[in-house]
């Protein structure tokens, strides 16, 4: 955890660090050991890759323990091939919108994520690409009878775009909140970040919060009951206390989880909100980080790693923040 | 995010006509559908009517008379309008998303008394 | 005029299962009700659980299923949680109108 102890490194001489991420000393001078990468949790011993221009932040001065490695201020972002300068606002395709800020890269959706359920007026909805539109449309099918109801006017015309809500509008500044990124980790703890301007000063900034979508030693597939495929949030039999790097949070937490499918889904977080939470470290000292806590779970195809680099990195972030 | 919010009068004499408007945003009522419910104090819900996406309106019978309900899509307004009010029409007014009732306003108190 | 039957108020252990019924005065329930199901919260609020008799509106937990049982429309909730505790409504559509039943007080025990 920090360099008061004497230098005790692992038996074997070196670690294989996966490709293009650098092999340093510790941030100890100690041992050689594989540096963390940007958005991953850092320490004093588990320094931030160098080479990257990566440093680990520590969010407030009084915590000196627990950090995420951050880019530093400028750095620019690699997105699908091209680079980025920060502050640079892109279109990474026509349903998104995206912000570098410091190395990281928030997107927001251009296209509605609505649901639709069935209605008297609209008793099949379905969800069509039309030509010439990027977004998918909400297209009702009429019954075969043509018992609906209201008169039956002309084709009813979709709204291609909204404007920005106006309670979002504050004097000289359009308040833009990116998603939260999907969870760094599928399992165990790991870091959700997003960029806001909801600040006083109207100035973009990078947000992280801790984020565990299931325990990593939980063999959830065992509770999927006969017959079905999926079990999207298994029942967390004892309340737990999240562990971050040495550190025991304060109090217990009855969490929610997502669980797993046998049908190749995955299942990830749908609706989440943020809250901090007390962690306590061996030497006395007590740090406060956001976490995320999970409300609901989705599983779904639009899995990590799946074609469409854009359509696979919404689909597995955060639904919203619900307060 | 889908959000609807009703605005109109608290108060409202007997004889007079009431009139609500529902501001909708994320989403469009070339879409979706917005439907009129109230809940006097203490009691259950009571549908009163629906404009659907495409224009046409369906009524409670019992209201059919008193009742108009009409939008304006480009600004995102529903609007409905209840004549003749009376103190037993004394309740909070919602408006709803057509397609399982699955986003409410927030609601509006609406006293009928002299 | 078309009556819609809740049962008045019902009870339920945390962790338990409990069915809400809604029942139409002039026949059996059917998909061509549209039946809905809404819970209004303590502090008010009303959202929307189930639309055309079974579909989950969004962000609505697995626990919450709509159906048809026998001539009813039914809202089960499995693993019942203290947050639950709500007023349900049903609401039926009839061709021209819909009509909401009288509502159903959740008590979740303990």
């Known amino acids: 955890q920090n360099c008061s102890g004497p230098c005790r490194c692992p038996a074997e001489q070196a670690p294989r660090c996966p490709a293009g991420v650098s092999l340093v000393l510790d941030g100890c001078g100690c041992c050689r050991v594989c540096a963390k990468q940007l958005g991953e949790l850092c320490t004093e011993r588990d320094p931030c890759d160098p080479h990257k221009g990566l440093f680990c932040d520590f969010g407030s001065p009084a915590n000196r323990k627990i950090g995420v490695c951050t880019a530093k201020d400028g750095a620019p972002c690699i997105f699908g091939g091209t680079v980025y300068r920060s502050g640079e606002s892109f279109q990474s395709s026509c349903k998104y919108q995206c912000t570098c800020l410091d190395g990281a890269v928030g997107c927001m959706p251009l296209c509605s994520m609505d649901v639709r359920l069935p209605s008297p007026d609209c008793p099949f909805p379905r969800r069509v690409k039309l030509p010439g539109k990027c977004c998918e449309e909400w297209v009702c099918d009429e019954p075969k009878d043509q018992t609906v109801v209201g008169p039956a006017l002309a084709a009813y015309r979709l709204e291609d775009t909204f404007g920005p809500d106006p309670t979002m509008i504050r004097a000289n500044c359009l308040v833009q909140t990116t998603e939260w990124s999907a969870c760094s980790k599928t399992c165990g703890m790991g870091i959700s970040t997003r960029v806001t301007n909801d600040n006083a000063s109207c100035r973009l900034e990078k947000q992280s919060r801790l984020c565990m979508v299931r325990p990593c030693e939980a063999d959830l597939e065992e509770n999927i009951k006969k017959g079905k495929k999926c079990i999207r949030t298994p029942k967390i039999s004892k309340p737990i206390k999240f562990e971050l790097s040495g550190c025991t949070s304060v109090k217990t937490y009855r969490a929610k989880f997502c669980g797993v499918c046998t049908d190749g889904r995955c299942c990830t977080p749908h609706r989440t909100t943020t809250l901090p939470v007390e962690f306590k470290c061996p030497d006395g000292e007590v740090m406060k980080k956001n976490m995320m806590f999970i409300k609901t779970c989705a599983c779904h195809y639009n899995c990590p790693g799946d074609n469409d680099i854009f359509e696979s990195l919404y689909y597995r972030k955060m639904y919203g923040d619900m307060a | 995010e889908v959000t609807l919010k009703e605005s109109g009068p608290v108060l409202v004499k007997p004889t007079e006509t009431l009139t609500l408007t529902c501001t909708v945003s994320?989403?469009?009522?070339?879409?979706?559908?917005v439907h009129w419910i109230r809940q006097p104090p203490g009691k259950g819900l009571e549908w009163l009517g629906v404009?659907?996406?495409?224009?046409?309106?369906d009524y409670n019978a019992a209201f059919m008379s008193r009742l108009t309900i009409s939008k304006d899509t480009s600004k995102s307004q529903v609007v409905f309008t209840m004549t003749n009010m009376d103190p037993v029409d004394t309740a909070t007014y919602y408006c709803?998303?057509?397609?399982?009732?699955?986003?409410w306003g927030q609601g509006t108190t609406v006293t009928v008394s002299s | 005029e078309t009556v819609v039957t809740q049962e008045p108020s019902f009870s339920v252990s945390p962790g338990g299962t409990v069915t809400l019924t809604c029942r139409s005065s002039?026949?059996?329930?059917?998909?061509?009700?549209?039946a809905n199901w809404v819970q209004q919260t303590p502090g008010q609020a009303f959202r929307g659980l189930i639309g055309?008799?079974?579909n989950r509106a969004p962000g609505v937990p697995d626990r919450f299923s709509g159906s048809i049982l026998g001539n009813k429309a039914a809202l089960t909730i499995t693993g019942a949680q203290a947050d639950d505790e709500s007023d349900y409504y049903c609401a039926l559509w009839y061709s021209t109108h819909y009509v909401f039943g009288g509502g159903t007080k959740l008590t979740v025990l303990g």
């Open positions: 002039i026949g059996a329930v059917t998909t061509s009700n549209y």
């Open positions: 404009i659907w996406r495409r224009g046409g309106t």
């Open positions: 994320g989403f469009s009522l070339s879409t979706f559908g």
């Open positions: 709803a998303r057509d397609g399982g009732f699955d986003y």
């Open positions: 055309g008799t079974s």
